[in-house]
């Protein structure tokens, strides 16, 4: 006769492991007992359990409540056992020793491999600001057995670097994603992808990028200088900028206070019917937590009675 088993049995942490051992004997042969032992190198054999044809299943105190026979129907030549709720410490070599009548003893070994699926974590890097050089956007760490694979899925251009730390029964892998921050990256997803044989599908953790920036400010509304004449209604100046975080706007007049009747509505400065006293230098001040910008314009309200128009100067400063 001969023993049938597996070279390797692979199980995920917490699952039940079936340790197979089947005696394929000649007719008339009987299995008297099947002894299971753990036989890791450098240590003596430690009995796990013994299946006795007359007295049933015996379990080592160290494995009390964790070793069972497979459910019926059972073949008397089948010495397989179930190891319940596999833990990492169960990983190792096991031996099945079958005592038969009248053929004698047979033995076979198998390796139990316990997969420990990773629980990945993603940690964002420092605040990203436009103008910085190569900066850490995020790091992703996953620990498991065997070592997991950690990669990145994103449309954003960047560089990755990985390092691995081996522990006694597992390995931790950390991957970092570096980029040169630009405003076009705002709102873009950066996804850490963790692969592992103990996972049915890849685990994904997504981080949304936030890059602080503030665009140059400019003022619109003076494109047609001829519209800025005495008596005109609905005249307005609009300050244009964008930023992250969204900026706030403030209007001032460089050569004095804002004239009465002029309304400030966020990025817009609204004028009452124009008079010559509305002429002056107006400044739009744009700011967010990252930076601030100024843009100033000169408003010259024309008197239709005068023949010659006056020029309008637009100056932008930061």
């Amino acid at each position: 006769g001969e023993l049938e088993t597996s070279d390797v049995v692979t199980v995920v942490l917490g699952q039940d492991a079936k340790l197979p051992c089947f005696y394929r004997g000649d007719s008339g042969e009987q299995v008297g007992q099947v002894a299971w032992a753990r036989v890791d190198a450098g240590e003596g054999a430690q009995e796990l359990a013994l299946l006795h044809s007359k007295y049933g299943l015996h379990v080592s105190p160290a494995y009390e409540g964790r070793v069972e026979q497979p459910p019926p129907p059972r073949n008397p030549l089948d010495g397989s056992v179930l190891l319940r709720n596999a833990v990492q410490a169960d990983e190792g070599e096991y031996e099945c020793r079958v005592s038969t009548f009248p053929a004698g003893s047979f033995q076979a070994r198998l390796r139990l491999r316990v997969l420990v699926p990773p629980l990945p974590s993603l940690n964002p890097g420092p605040a990203l600001e436009e103008g910085q050089g190569l900066t850490l956007a995020a790091s992703c760490t996953a620990e498991g057995s065997p070592a997991p694979s950690v990669t990145w899925d994103t449309e954003v251009k960047g560089t990755t670097s990985s390092r691995s730390f081996k522990h006694s029964r597992s390995a931790a892998v950390t991957s970092e994603f570096h980029l040169v921050p630009s405003r076009s990256m705002n709102g873009q997803p950066l996804t850490c992808v963790v692969s592992h044989p103990g996972l049915l599908q890849d685990q994904r953790i997504t981080h949304i990028l936030h890059v602080s920036f503030l665009a140059e400010a400019s003022v619109r509304g003076l494109e047609d200088q001829n519209l800025w004449h005495i008596g005109r209604e609905g005249a307005m100046l609009k300050c244009l900028s964008e930023g992250q975080p969204p900026p706030s706007y403030n209007w001032t007049r460089l050569d004095g206070p804002l004239p009465s009747g002029v309304r400030v509505d966020g990025d817009t400065l609204g004028f009452p019917p124009l008079t010559t006293e509305h002429s002056g230098i107006y400044v739009c001040h744009v700011s967010n937590e990252f930076s601030s910008r100024d843009s100033q314009v000169t408003v010259d309200v024309l008197d239709p009675q005068e023949d010659s128009g006056k020029q309008v100067d637009l100056v932008s400063a930061s």
Epitope: Q30, G32, Q33, A35, A37, A45, Q46, E47, L48, A49, L50, H52, S53, K54, Y55, H58, V59, S60, P61, S99, F101, P102
Partner: nanobody
Framework: EVQLVESGGGLVQPGGSLRLSCAAS????????MGWHRQAPGKQRELVAT???????NYADSVKGRFTISRDNGKNTVYLQMNSLRAEDTAAYYC?????????????WGQGTQVTVSS
């Protein structure tokens, strides 16, 4: 042949403890199983506990958590530590040595030792 000698029986009050011993001699095999059965008056003999050479154990449900079986392979001796004894544990306790024989197993029995639990 195998010879078995039990000792340690006696009279004990409910809740008390006793330790039985059984020494085996003769042709003991390397794959033998040792254990204890008991037989109360007018009842059939029932398995109490058995232990393998490697220390794996099997207990009757009625004694789990109260009785502990152990063995010393060097001395070919098996022990039964009995705690929290009850009146229903009163019986003759028999040591058994299970040896391979031909096409199966042969049980060798001791003469028994009496355990009486009574107040």
């Amino acid at each position: 042949e195998v010879q078995l000698v039990e000792s340690g029986g006696g009279l004990v009050q409910p809740g008390g403890s006793l330790r039985l011993s059984c020494a085996a001699s003769g042709s003991i095999s390397s794959i033998n199983l040792m254990g204890w059965h008991r037989q109360a008056p007018g009842k059939q003999r029932e398995l109490v506990a058995t232990i393998t050479r490697g220390g794996s154990t099997n207990y009757a449900d009625s004694v789990k958590g109260r009785f502990t079986i152990s063995r010393d392979n060097g001395k070919n001796t098996v022990y039964l530590q009995m705690n929290s004894l009850r009146a229903e544990d009163t019986a003759a306790y028999y040591c058994v040595d299970v040896e391979p024989s031909g096409m199966g197993w042969r049980d060798y029995w001791g003469q028994g030792t009496q355990v009486t639990v009574s107040s």
